[in-house]
Every structure is written in C-alpha cells, then in structure tokens.
C-alpha cells in the first residue's frame, strides 16, 4: 500500500491570511518611508512633484465605509504593479545621481514584488475573481535630465508611501469585517 494520505487540507483562515499581508504592507511602508527620507536628505525636494503616469489615489476617509475586499485587493494590486514598473524604470533610467540610492532601491523593488505575489496568493486563497492579465503598458519615457530623474523619484516614492499608508488602513479595516 502507498503512503497514508496526508491530513485533509485545511482552508486557510482569511483573517490570518490578511494579517500576514498587512505585516508585509507595513514593512514595505517603513522601507519606503526610509528611502524617501534618504532621497530628501540627498536631493531636497523643492515643492511637490507629480508624474502623470502614476496611478491616481484610490482611497480616502470617505471611501472607507464602502470598502469591499475584492475591489480593494484588485485596485491595490493594479496600483502596486504600476509603482513596481516605475521603480524598475527609475533604477534603469534615473541617471547616475540615483545610483546613490542603491542597494536600497533594489531592495524596495524586491519587496514590492513580494507583496504583489502575496496579494495574488491572497486573492486566489480567498477565491476572489482573478483580474485579467495586465495589458502591456506603454513604455515610460526617460527623464529629460538628471534633475528630472530626481523629481520623478520624489513623485514615485511619495506616491508609493501614500498608497501603502492607505493600504494598511484599508486592509486593517477589512480584517474586522471578515
């Protein structure tokens, strides 16, 4: 006879699954905060910086009451994929000045990638509808100057920090509703 069958597969506790996602998101939030501070120290920001290709903000105090898990995870995943693409672009095309942010920028990219995989796993474990494959995004134009790369870095890290900040709050709130 073959080996005895293994224990029955226990369906994961959604709150525990969400908990570990919150921990990863919080950890990435702290990493992003540190890197943004490092960037500000090296290249002080003169005012606010925007990048049209970055996702628009998805959450605010007013949106919290109507949050639904599928919508939050789908939107968060889409936004973080966009930020991952921007971080990759920054590392590749940001210019020599931004090389001073390595290896931290590389670490941030790896952790962002890990969080995205975690979100994908969470969505499949919770049997949420999987989003369609992402259409190929148009390539990002290289910055027009070294200073353009630095301004883009301020916008990307600032936007990512804000997105992660709201993500933690939203995920914590959703956990209480499970």
């Amino acid at each position: 006879p073959g080996p005895p069958p293994g224990p029955p597969r226990v369906s994961p506790d959604p709150r525990a699954e969400l908990d570990s996602t919150v921990l990863l998101t919080r950890s990435l939030l702290a990493d992003t905060r540190q890197l943004a501070a490092q960037l500000r120290d090296k290249f002080p920001a003169d005012g606010d910086h925007n990048l049209d290709s970055l996702p628009t903000l998805a959450m605010s105090a007013g949106a919290l009451g109507a949050l639904q898990l599928p919508g939050v995870l789908t939107r968060l995943r889409a936004d973080l994929l966009s930020y991952l693409r921007h971080v990759q672009w920054l590392r590749r095309a940001g210019g020599s000045s931004l090389k001073t942010l390595e290896p931290e920028l590389g670490t941030l990219q790896a952790r962002l990638d890990r969080l995205l995989r975690r979100l994908q796993l969470l969505m499949s474990r919770l049997a949420l509808p999987q989003p369609p494959p992402d259409p190929p995004a148009p390539p990002l134009a290289p910055p027009s100057s070294a200073w353009g790369g630095i301004r883009a870095a301020h916008a990307i890290l600032g936007g990512l920090h804000l997105t992660l900040d709201w993500a933690v709050r939203g995920l914590l709130l959703l956990k209480t509703r499970l």
Partner: antibody, heavy 117, light 110 residues
Framework: EVQLLESGGGLVQPGGSLRLSCAAS????????MNWLRQAPGKGLEWVGV????????FYADFVKGRFTISRDNSKNTLYLQMNSLRAEDTAVYYC??????????WGQGTLVTVSS | QSVLTQPPSASGTPGQRVTISCSGS????????VNWYQQLPGTAPKLLIY???LLPSGVPDRFSGSKSGTSASLAISGLRSEDEADYYC???????????FGGGTKLTVL
C-alpha cells in the same frame, strides 16, 4: 518641506461666526485628506473633523455637527473651517493637520479662537 | 472624559526607561491603528508613532510603540531632558466614526 499655516483666529462673541484658513505648501495638497483639531487652554487634543482629498466626503465630531463646516480649495492649496453658533467651550487653539492614512503626519502651528462676551 | 484612557502623569530620571499606557475598546484600539503624538511645551503636536509601532522619519529609535488587544503603550528608553512633554495616544473609533484621543500624559524628567 511640508508647511501648514493657519489663520483667521481671534475674539468672537457667543453665537458669532468665524472662518479659519489653513494654507498648505511643500506637498501635493489634492492628494491628502485634511483635518481640523483643537486644544482648549490647558486641556487635551480633540479631533474636529476630516475632509477627503477631493472634498467629496466629510466626517465631524459630534460636538460640532451642524455648527462647523470643513471645505477646501485644491486650486488654492487651502483648507477652511467655517464655525457658526460659537460657544464659550469652543475656545481653543485650532490646528489643521494632514492625513496620509490613519494618522496626522504634519500639523500647523495653530490659531487661537476665543469665544467671550 | 476622554474615550482612550492614559495616566495623567509619568516621570523618570535621565537614562531611564519609561512606559505610558493607553487603553480603549474593540471599536477603537482593538480594530484600528494606534498613533502617538508628542507635544513639547508651547508647540504644536508632532507624530511620534504610527500604525502601532512604526517610527516616522526623524524620530529617534529610543521611542517605541506596541499594542495588544485593546491596549497600547509607548516606551521611551534612555530618557533625556528634551523628552519632557505631553504624550497623546489616538485611534479611529468605528462607533463614533471619528478620531479619539487619550487625555494625555505629562512626562516629567526629574
């Protein structure tokens, strides 16, 4: 550098009105929810209310509902607090503060509102 | 009467470790992030800890936060004279649909 600068405080009689302003600079104002908080002389901090980044949603503390209104003008990077039917117990330093998630990460220096006859 | 409960005062000598507690309920601390603010005499409050235990840029790691159930605490190690201030805990309250604060703890460095 993020800066928040309140103005418009002063002495007002009970039942009167006052409008406070908060001028923001150093960040993309239209991306952030903004709050008003207050602190009565010698007392603790009290949250007054919040307005969402696009102005579409507002939440208020029970003690100001129907009397205070928060608004914002993103084209002017300015937050407002319209205070009506003021009472002596509304005497406080009023602060504006930025919210990126669940917390207030930057605060203004405050403006004093005194309600007295 | 504040929704969150903090001791009105705390004290310690330079170099000591001091802890300030903050207790609430499931509708605030139990279900939401706890944040701590420091208010030095005559100044506006400043964010000290967010999401229970994260430190904003520029805050020394002598400060730390923790949360368990419906209670949270702020710890300050290697106490310094410049830490003399009022400390407030805060959290969103689901029942009140707003932010609630503790009454504040006045920290004296002896």
């Amino acid at each position: 550098e993020v800066q928040l600068l309140e103005s418009g405080g002063g002495l007002v009689q009970p039942g009167g009105s006052l409008r406070l302003s908060c001028a923001a600079s150093g960040f993309t104002f239209s991306h952030y929810d903004m709050n008003w908080l207050r602190q009565a002389p010698g007392k603790g901090l009290e949250w007054v209310g919040v307005i969402s980044y696009d102005g579409s949603n507002k939440f208020y503390a029970d003690f100001v509902k129907g009397r205070f209104t928060i608004s914002r003008d993103n084209s002017k990077n300015t937050l407002y607090l319209q205070m009506n039917s003021l009472r002596a117990e509304d005497t406080a330093v009023y602060y504006c503060a930025r919210t990126p998630g669940s917390h207030f990460d930057y605060w203004g220096q405050g403006t004093l509102v005194t309600v007295s006859s | 009467q504040s929704v969150l409960t903090q001791p009105p005062s705390a004290s310690g000598t330079p170099g000591q470790r001091v802890t300030i507690s903050c207790s609430g309920s499931s509708s605030n601390i139990g279900n939401n992030a706890v944040n701590w603010y420091q208010q030095l005499p005559g100044t506006a409050p400043k964010l000290l800890i967010y999401y229970d235990d994260l430190l904003p840029s520029g805050v020394p790691d002598r400060f730390s936060g923790s949360k368990s159930g419906t209670s949270a605490s702020l710890a300050i190690s290697g106490l310094r004279s410049e830490d003399e201030a009022d400390y407030y805990c805060a959290a969103w309250d689901d029942s009140l649909n707003g932010v609630v604060f503790g009454g504040g703890t006045k920290l004296t460095v002896l």
